[in-house]
Every structure is written in C-alpha cells, then in structure tokens.
Amino acid sequence: QFLKEGQLAAGTCEVIAAHRDSSQPRRTIARQTARCACRKGQIAGTTRARPACVDARIIKTKQWCDMLPCLEGEGCDLLINRSGWTCTQPGGRIKTTTVS
C-alpha cells in the first residue's frame, strides 16, 4: 500500500513543529509534540526517548516504564502517584518527564 505525502505508516510516529495542523491526534511528552498513526490497541507514548506507539494498557495503568521510555543503559523509575517517570543516566544524572 502506497502512502500519500504526509501520511504516516501504521504504528509509527514523527516529531512535528508546534505550528502544524492541530487536527492531528497528538500527545505532548516532555514538551515534545509528535504525530502518530497508531494501530488499534495502541496510543502515542515514548520509547527510547523517542515518540512511539505503545500498548494502550500501559497508559491506562500508568506503568510508564513498561514503554521503555529511557535510553538503553538508563534506569527507569515511576514518579510518586505515577504522574510520570525518571530516567537515570549511568553517571547519576536524572531526567524527569511528567504526564499531564
């Protein structure tokens, strides 16, 4: 199946500029806006620090670390009350992402 210009392949995401068409389904993660074409049962999330389609159950249960949101070699921890997650780099620096 051929894709039209600007059309995303099923199950994929792309980072978009803030001024793009607001009618597209999107989710802001760590202030980064992405456009995703997720399959049934999937929703826009983050995998390896990039926008990705993830199992919708992960979002529903707020088990954010199951998305594998951090880079390889980093540790993932849920924030208190599952409001997001932290990625801990090998040297101990942490990056926190909150989900609104």
Epitope: Q89, P90, G91, G92
Partner: antibody
Framework: QEQLVESGGRLVTPGTTLTLTCTVS????????VSWVRQAPGKGLEWIGY??????PHYASWAKGRFTISKTSSTTVDLKMTSLTTEDTATYFC?????????WGPGTLVTVSS | ELDLTQTPSSVSAAVGGTVTINCQAS????????LAWYQQKPGQPPKLLIY???TLASGVSSRFKGSGSGTQFTLTISDVQCDDAATYYC?????????????FGGGTELEIL
C-alpha cells in the same frame, strides 16, 4: 509555580568558608536534579556542580575539593565553598537541571575582598 | 578537558535580520543531542530557549531555532527584534560517569543596530 531562590551571599575576606543555600518550591528534589552555576562580573557562565536525589554530587574538574554540594532538606540544596579567593567573586545561581536548566534562581552575590 | 567553543563572541544585526551562532563541543554531548541554548540580559538569570538541540522551551518564540548533533550545534534567530539584544550561551550535557556533567560556551553578545 516552580521556583528557586539562592541565599547566603555576602562580602567575605580571602580564606573564608561560606555556605550558600538554594531553596526550591513547586517541585520535588526527589524527582529533579539541581545545578549550581556562577558568573563573575562581566564574564560568562561557569558550571560548578550537580546533585540529583540520593546520588553523589558531581563537580566541574576545577571545583573538586573546594566546593561541596549537599541536599540538606526536602526543599534545600547547599553549596559550601572553602578557602575563598578574589577569583571566586561572582553571582551564584542554582537551577533545576532537567531538560536544560529551567527555572533559575535570581542569584546571590559573593564578594571576596581583603 | 571538556570545552564548548562558541562563535562569534559578538555579533550585530539589524531589526528583521537573521543571526547564526555556532557551538562546537570538544566531545559528543550525551545522546548526541543534549545541548541547550540560553538568553541572558544584564542583571537577570539566564532564560532557557532550546533544549535537546532543537526543542523550543515553553513560551519561547519560534523565531529561535536550534539544530545540530554530536559536536556541532547552531542557534538561528530570524526576524531579529530589539528585545533580542542579549548574551546567548550554549550548554552541553555529558555523561557524569566519564567527565564533567555540564559545560557552557563562552557566550555570544548580540547587538541590535
């Protein structure tokens, strides 16, 4: 509102030990790291060190030994400076260090003079 | 020793013009993209403009654009305004386990003609 405020800056003589305090509000130090940065009058920004929740602090190579960063409470991070010299005269900032440093405190001025 | 070299150290631009500031790291930043840009005006703390090399910070005008990866990065300011007069700094993040966690460039002073 996420906020940081530095305190403790003052005029001291060379050789003095001084402790600056960064007090945060609107976010938790258990979830975010904090960096200390200084700026000498008319000069650029100079990173001093970083601390994240329960991890050991990290320092710029030039700051190791004379500067100590510690989390002193759930809302405060201290910067202890020993054997101060006139070269340490600067405005000292603390900033939440996450995806870039944001927000920053207004800074506190340390003047070292005899 | 970690080093971030910013060029030029000062630049002048007319209102409506475009300015480009370069930042070169002596080694690759963490994840090849952990570089931020700041704007600082006299008597104020720095203000975050861009993080992760190209992501605009909240509330920052889209006239500011960041690009680059690895060791070479650029900040472009288009349609320059009088209010853009300030000093701009790049800041690289590095692995805390092998080097200094952070380093700043020397700064670029922007003067509006």
């Amino acid at each position: 509102q996420e906020q940081l405020v530095e305190s403790g800056g003052r005029l001291v003589t060379p050789g003095t030990t001084l402790t600056l305090t960064c007090t945060v509000s609107g976010f938790s130090l258990s979830s975010y790291g904090v960096s200390w940065v200084r700026q000498a009058p008319g000069k650029g920004l100079e990173w001093i060190g970083y601390i994240a929740n329960n991890y050991n602090p990290h320092y710029a190579s030039w700051a190791k030994g004379r500067f100590t960063i510690s989390k002193t409470s759930s809302t405060t991070v201290d910067l202890k400076m020993t054997s101060l010299t006139t070269e340490d005269t600067a405005t000292y900032f603390c900033a939440r260090d996450n995806y870039g440093m944001d927000p920053w405190g207004p800074g506190t001025l340390v003047t070292v003079s005899s | 020793e970690l080093d971030l070299t910013q060029t030029p150290s000062s630049v002048s631009a007319a209102v409506g013009g475009t300015v480009t500031i370069n930042c070169q790291a002596s080694q690759s930043v963490y994840n090849n993209k952990n570089l931020a840009w700041y704007q600082q005006k006299p008597g104020q703390p720095p203000k975050l403009l861009i993080y992760a090399a190209s992501t605009l910070a909240s509330g920052v005008s889209s006239r500011f654009k960041g690009s680059g990866s690895g060791t070479q990065f650029t900040l472009t300011i288009s349609d320059v305004q009088c209010d853009d007069a300030a000093t701009y700094y790049c800041q690289g993040e590095f692995s805390c386990s092998s080097a200094d966690c952070n380093a700043f460039g020397g700064g670029t002073e922007l003067e509006i003609l």
